[in-house]
């Protein structure tokens, strides 16, 4: 017989039939035929398929290996994987996250502008005039100077971008 | 309820075109294919095509594919039939209809038309 | 395509009676088949989907089975009001067939 013109939706074109896919969570035991409907079945424990899909197999669900630096961030389903992210102080190295590489730290004269998550890495920005940072760190913003004169003191010693002005007391003039 | 409501009678000439409208209402316009067909006076049902109003997907039978251009306006759930090069023997009564279905045993059945419409008579004469 | 053939086209019966109509298919259809109700000037009705199941709000005497690629639609107990034709429809995949259809007479 000539095939069918075409599938509706959720249906493919096997041996001139229009067979149903199975629905995801499901995969394909047998075709259908002329006389018997597709035949589907539950994927396993730790198995999944997202899609209506014709696959023979369902897929295993990602293993968030803490060797790695991962870790489960959602617990797949039969219709969905399992999500990792990394542990703590740790971000995913590309968007399907299979490796963890530590966070960066913001060197000195450099300050955090944004902290990093368990799928991006520290952003540091240079500390602007006005503003400075002292240490290596993945959280520390760059931190303003010190404001001598509402202290009532004067600039001993410029700050830079790596160091805080020193203030002094000012000079008494002698009588 | 459920409703597919047709425009409304034509008189055309042998060789003009004509556009026959089925509003939906009672019911989601984008998860129901849309099925046109037609019944010539005194004589049976037959199947011109269909539309998917979600997708646009059509499909027609051979002896249309040429002539029918099925379409949708979701924003309006309204589904078109448009028939061109018409003929005498293009005189008939045209239906949309709904075909629904329903999932069981992992899959997604097919379960023909459900709901028609009123039907819109399309006379062609000179 | 799919053809249906559909018998008889046309018979005569009386109220009460049991009446009893096949659509063959040229192919195997599992079970995506229909049964349809027309009645003069009206748009068809669907009575039975899935070669079997019966739509909600038809009579108990309407009644749909199966056996390989031929297929039957029984009426009980014929009523006045079931005096119409009758259409079968494959929906397998397309084109979607219908079969010529069975004018139902009062005898």
């Known amino acids: 017989p000539e095939p069918p013109t075409a599938c509706r939706e959720k249906q493919y074109l096997i041996n001139s039939q229009c067979c149903s896919l199975c629905q995801p969570g499901q995969k394909l035991v047998s075709d259908c035929t002329e006389f018997t409907e597709t035949e589907c079945l539950p994927c396993g424990e730790s198995e999944f398929l997202d899609t209506w899909n014709r696959e023979t197999h369902c897929h295993q669900h990602k293993y968030c290996d803490p060797n790695l630096g991962l870790r489960v961030q959602q617990k797949g389903t039969s219709e969905t994987d399992t999500i990792c992210t990394c542990e703590e102080g740790w971000h995913c190295t590309s968007e399907a996250c299979e490796s963890c590489v530590l966070h960066r730290s913001c060197s000195p004269g450099f300050g955090v502008k944004q902290i990093a998550t368990g799928v991006s890495d520290t952003i540091c920005e240079p500390c602007p005039v006005g503003f400075f940072s002292n240490v290596s760190s993945a959280f520390e913003k760059c931190h303003p100077w010190t404001s001598c004169e509402t202290k009532d003191l004067v600039v001993q010693q410029a700050g830079t971008n790596k160091t805080d002005v020193v203030c002094g007391p000012q000079d008494r003039l002698r009588a | 309820q459920v409703q597919l409501v047709q425009s409304g009678a034509e008189v055309k000439k042998p060789g003009a075109s004509v556009k026959v409208s089925c509003k939906a209402s009672g019911y989601t316009f984008t998860d129901y294919y849309i099925h046109w067909v037609r019944q010539a006076p005194g004589q049976g049902l037959e199947w011109m095509g269909w539309?998917?109003?979600?997708?646009?997907?059509?499909s027609y039978a051979q002896k249309f594919q040429d002539r029918v251009t099925v379409t949708r306006d979701t924003s309006i759930n309204t589904a078109y039939m448009e028939l061109s090069r018409l003929k005498s023997d293009d005189t008939a009564v045209y239906y949309c209809?709904?075909?629904?279905?329903?999932?069981?045993?992992?899959?997604?059945?097919?379960?023909?038309?459900?709901?028609w419409g009123q039907g819109t008579t399309v006379t062609v004469s000179s | 395509d799919i053809q249906m053939t559909q018998s008889p086209s046309s018979l005569s019966a009386s109220v009460g009676d049991r009446v009893t109509i096949t659509c063959r298919a040229s192919?195997?259809?599992?079970?995506?088949l229909g049964w349809y109700q027309q009645k003069p000037g009206k748009a068809p009705k669907r009575l039975i989907y899935?070669?079997?199941s019966l739509d909600s709000g038809v009579p108990s005497r309407f009644s749909g089975s199966r056996s390989g690629s031929e297929f039957t639609l029984t009426i009980s107990s014929l009523q006045p009001e079931d005096f119409a034709t009758y259409y079968c429809?494959?929906?397998?995949?397309?084109?979607?067939?219908f079969g010529g259809g069975t004018k139902v007479e009062i005898k």
């Open positions: 209809a709904r075909e629904v279905g329903g999932y069981g045993s992992g899959t997604y059945r097919y379960y023909g038309m459900d709901v």
């Open positions: 429809l494959q929906y397998s995949g397309s084109p979607l067939t």
């Open positions: 539309i998917n109003p979600n997708s646009g997907d059509t």
């Open positions: 192919q195997g259809i599992r079970n995506e």
């Open positions: 899935a070669a079997s």
